[in-house]
Structures are given as structure tokens and as C-alpha cells.
């Protein structure tokens, strides 16, 4: 997605994105919340393509693992968080059961806060 | 994604997330920026699904519609902002050609800053 | 600039070992499934062997399964190849091509390394 | 294995002229074709993917289509750099990825 940086803007959140493939990814939870296996390989029409993923999450290494930036911490505490949505994949259930599922994937990192105490 | 609100705390940007059809979507953008028509089913091998996205996007109707939660006003301006990532789709171009590109859907809601200058 | 580099090629005896690198620069590494191709001298192009962006998932040519091994060290920006037990048959240009995202093609290659087996 | 057969084995042509590449493959492969140019002593370079999807910064004269397992690869006023050996890539069905043989383009 666009780099807030090129418009002079920084983020709340510094967030990393890669491309991830599901030979990489092998595992992810459904919308129940089952475990299920990522096929590396979805049939098409006229041939295979890879399953690929395109994540974002927090930066670890970045200057917001400690907080986020730009808070009034005089009221409030902050922390970055990596957020996930839902995208369709082909998968194996536990039952070797093969279907379209939708899988969570990291996909922000969002700014939440708790107010502080007893200042 | 989990509600932050459920642990007690709030989100700097307030977000909504929905289901969108390929009905309802009808176009996208693919990944070289190209204006793509996202088709309504994909044949599956016992059938067809219906191309379903999850997206997420800033809510228009929310505090956070004037700027991000938190942030210490004295410094900063701030904005709330809908980020995209990138989804795989059955599509078609503008020649005609169909087949799954990666599309730009919107997937979060993020606070942007810019530093105040002239204080 | 997205740059290949290769090296480790040489004249080498049938039945011994070589290991060829590729260093990589110019984009973000982990995000790309990398490959091995090799061209004998005056002959077309084979494929040998993928490994993707994580190093989770590999894949190799029958003509070199059990013999090639392919590997990656995202922290150094370095594609690997360790080639044993070869053969005359295994005298090409060995060069390190990226994968795109987008398919199974390359769009990316490198200058590559010359591995002349000989006795 | 998919076998691609690329043909003829070498094109003489004028420059200027236009020059017409095919490559036939085994069994059907959908859109999942790549061709390449090598130039003596360089690596290759991608052209075309997707069968007529062209890459990065390369020219217009270049163009691919596809009519079932036949692909054709087109170039319309062959220049002076064009002059090279051409090689297509399916990408349908792996492991494994493979090439046509290649098409030498020369000046005649």
C-alpha cells in the first residue's frame, strides 16, 4: 500500500509487508478457528498457480515497539498492533477434508490505546 | 479482526469492516494499476463460488473522521487513513483477458502524521 | 536496480562437489521464490531447481533430484546451490533468475557462473 | 512433463522486416507462457508473460498471442538489437518449468 513518507507523513505504526507464499506459510486458522494446512498449489482452469499472500504486520525492529508515535502520553498508553482480516484460500481441513476456505492473515498494524490511571 | 474495545482499549482510528460480492465490487485496480472488471464467480472444481472480500476501510460515520485519537495535538496533525493490500482475483482486463491478477482491496484504517510547524 | 551476482563455478571432476551463491541486491529478497537455471554450452535453457521466499518450500528438475540442494539465507540476501556427485552432463552457465510474483516466469537474471566437469 | 517445440529452429530476416516465432506445446497450458530474448554472452531477459502480457520497458514491437497450445511471438520492425535467440517458458503445469528449444533470429 501507498508510503505515508512520500508525502511527508509518518505512521502511528511502523509496519512491515512481504510476500508470503503458502509453501512458507503452510498453516493458518479459518473463520471457526480450526488449524488447517495451505495448499501450496491451486488448480486453475489450465494449470496450477502458487498460492500467495501479501502481509503486513508491526515492525519489530522498527522505533514503535515501544508505543506508538505521536500519542499524548500524558493521558494515555499506547501499543502498535498487528490487526488480521480474512482472504480465501485453498486448504486441507484435519479430516484431509480439501476446500475455498477464508483464512486470517496479518494484513495492518493499527495504534490502540488504554487511558491511564490515576495520574 | 479481535476487538480491541473487548480488552478495554480503543483504536486510535475507528474502522468498519464488511462482506463485499464481486457484484457489489464490479472493478478493481490490479497490482500494474490497470482497471480491472473482478468477476462475479470462479469455477471451482465441483461448481462455483461466489468471489466474496473481506475489506476494512475508516468509517466515515466515527469519532476519527477529523483526525486519530490520542495523538498529542500540540505536535502533531493527524488523519485517519484507509490503507490496501493486495488480494488475488479472478479478473478481467480491458482486452478481454481473464485470468487471477492481484487486486488492491482496502483492508485497514490507520493514523497518519504530519508535524506541526510555526508553533 | 535488482542485481544478480553469481560465483563458485569452476573446473571440477565428475564425482566432486561445488557450491554456487547468488547475491542479491536491489529488492527485498524474502518477498521473491528464487531459481537455478542452467544453460549447457551451446544448448537451450533448463530448469534445475526454485526454492521460495522463505526457504519453506523446494523444488528440483528430476536430473538433479538427490544430488542438488537448493538454499537461501534471507539475513545475508544469498541464493545457494550445492551440486554433488557431478557429471559431465552438469558442464553449463548456471545462472540464479528471481521469480516473479505474478507467476511462475523470471524476471530477473543473473550474468551467471560457468561449472565445467571434466577429467 | 510439458514439452514445448519452438519453430523454426532459425529465422533469417531483414531488418526492418517482421518476424513471426512460434511455439507449440504438449498438452493445453492456458495463458501460462513466458518468452525470452538472449543476446551471445548475455543472460536472458523476460519479454512477454502471460502469453501477451509485455514486461517492463519493453518495446511495443514486441507482442505475444495464443490460439489454444500455439503461441506466437511477433516482432514488427525487427531493429538491429533484436537480432538473438528466442526461448518460450510454460508455467502451467510444475515442477517442472519448461523451455522451447529457442529461435535464432539473424540478419540476413
Known amino acids: 500500500h501507498s508510503d505515508p513518507a512520500r508525502r511527508g507523513e509518518l505512521s502511528v505504526c511502523d509496519s512491515i509487508s512481504e510476500w508470503v507464499t503458502a509453501a512458507d506459510k503452510k498453516t493458518a486458522v479459518d473463520m471457526s478457528g480450526g488449524t488447517v494446512t495451505v495448499l501450496e498449489k491451486v488448480p486453475v482452469s489450465k494449470g496450477q498457480l502458487k498460492q500467495y499472500f501479501y502481509e503486513t504486520k508491526c515492525n519489530p525492529m522498527g522505533y514503535t515497539k515501544e508505543g506508538c508515535r505521536g500519542i499524548d502520553k500524558r493521558h494515555w498508553n499506547s501499543q502498535c498492533r498487528t490487526t488480521q482480516s480474512y482472504v480465501r484460500a485453498l486448504t486441507m481441513d484435519s479430516k484431509k477434508r480439501i476446500g475455498w476456505r477464508f483464512i486470517r492473515i496479518d494484513t495492518s498494524c493499527v495504534c490502540t490505546l488504554t487511558i491511564k490511571r490515576g495520574r | 479482526h479481535s476487538d480491541p474495545a473487548r480488552r478495554g482499549e480503543l483504536s486510535v482510528c475507528d474502522s468498519i469492516s464488511e462482506w463485499v460480492t464481486a457484484a457489489d465490487k464490479k472493478t478493481a485496480v490490479d497490482m500494474s494499476g490497470g482497471t480491472v472488471t473482478v468477476l462475479e464467480k470462479v469455477p471451482v472444481s465441483k461448481g462455483q463460488l461466489k468471489q466474496y472480500f473481506y475489506e476494512t476501510k475508516c468509517n466515515p460515520m466515527g469519532y476519527t473522521k477529523e483526525g486519530c485519537r490520542g495523538i498529542d495535538k500540540r505536535h502533531w496533525n493527524s488523519q485517519c487513513r484507509t490503507t490496501q493490500s493486495y488480494v488475488r482475483a479472478l479478473t478481467m482486463d480491458s482486452k478481454k483477458r481473464i485470468g487471477w491478477r492481484f487486486i488492491r482491496i482496502d483492508t485497514s484504517c490507520v493514523c497518519t502524521l504530519t508535524i506541526k510547524r510555526g508553533r | 536496480d535488482v542485481q544478480l551476482v553469481e560465483s563458485g563455478g569452476g573446473v571440477v571432476r565428475p564425482g566432486e562437489s561445488l557450491r554456487l551463491s547468488c547475491a542479491a541486491s536491489?529488492?527485498?529478497?524474502?518477498?521473491?521464490?528464487m531459481n537455478w537455471v542452467r544453460q549447457a554450452p551451446g544448448e537451450g535453457l533448463e530448469w534445475v531447481s526454485g526454492?521460495?521466499?522463505?526457504?519453506?518450500?523446494?523444488y528440483y528438475a528430476d536430473s538433479v533430484k538427490g544430488r542438488f540442494t537448493i538454499s537461501r539465507d534471507n539475513s545475508k540476501n544469498t541464493l545457494y546451490l550445492q551440486i554433488n556427485s557431478l557429471r559431465a552432463e552438469d558442464t553449463a552457465i548456471y545462472y540464479c533468475?528471481?521469480?516473479?510474483?505474478?507467476?511462475?516466469?523470471?524476471?530477473?537474471w543473473g550474468l551467471g557462473t560457468l561449472v565445467t566437469v571434466s577429467s | 512433463e510439458i514439452v514445448l517445440t519452438q519453430s523454426p529452429g532459425t529465422l533469417t530476416v531483414s531488418p526492418g522486416d517482421r518476424a513471426t516465432l512460434s511455439c507449440r506445446a504438449s498438452?493445453?497450458?492456458?495463458?501460462?507462457l513466458a518468452w525470452y530474448q538472449q543476446k551471445p554472452g548475455q543472460a536472458p531477459r523476460l519479454l512477454i508473460y502471460?502469453?501477451?502480457s509485455r514486461a517492463t520497458g519493453i518495446p511495443d514491437r514486441f507482442s505475444g498471442s495464443e490460439s489454444g497450445t500455439d503461441f506466437t511471438l511477433t516482432i514488427n520492425g525487427l531493429a538491429p538489437e533484436d537480432f538473438a535467440v528466442y526461448y518460450c517458458?510454460?508455467?502451467?503445469?510444475?515442477?517442472?518449468?519448461?523451455f522451447g528449444g529457442g529461435t535464432k533470429v539473424e540478419i540476413k
Open positions: 533468475a528471481r521469480e516473479s510474483i505474478w507467476g511462475i516466469f523470471f524476471d530477473y
Open positions: 498438452q493445453t497450458i492456458g495463458s501460462y
Open positions: 536491489g529488492f527485498t529478497f524474502n518477498n521473491h521464490d
Open positions: 526454492i521460495s521466499g522463505r526457504g519453506g518450500g523446494t
Open positions: 502471460d502469453a501477451s
Open positions: 517458458q510454460q508455467y502451467s503445469n510444475w515442477p517442472p518449468l519448461t
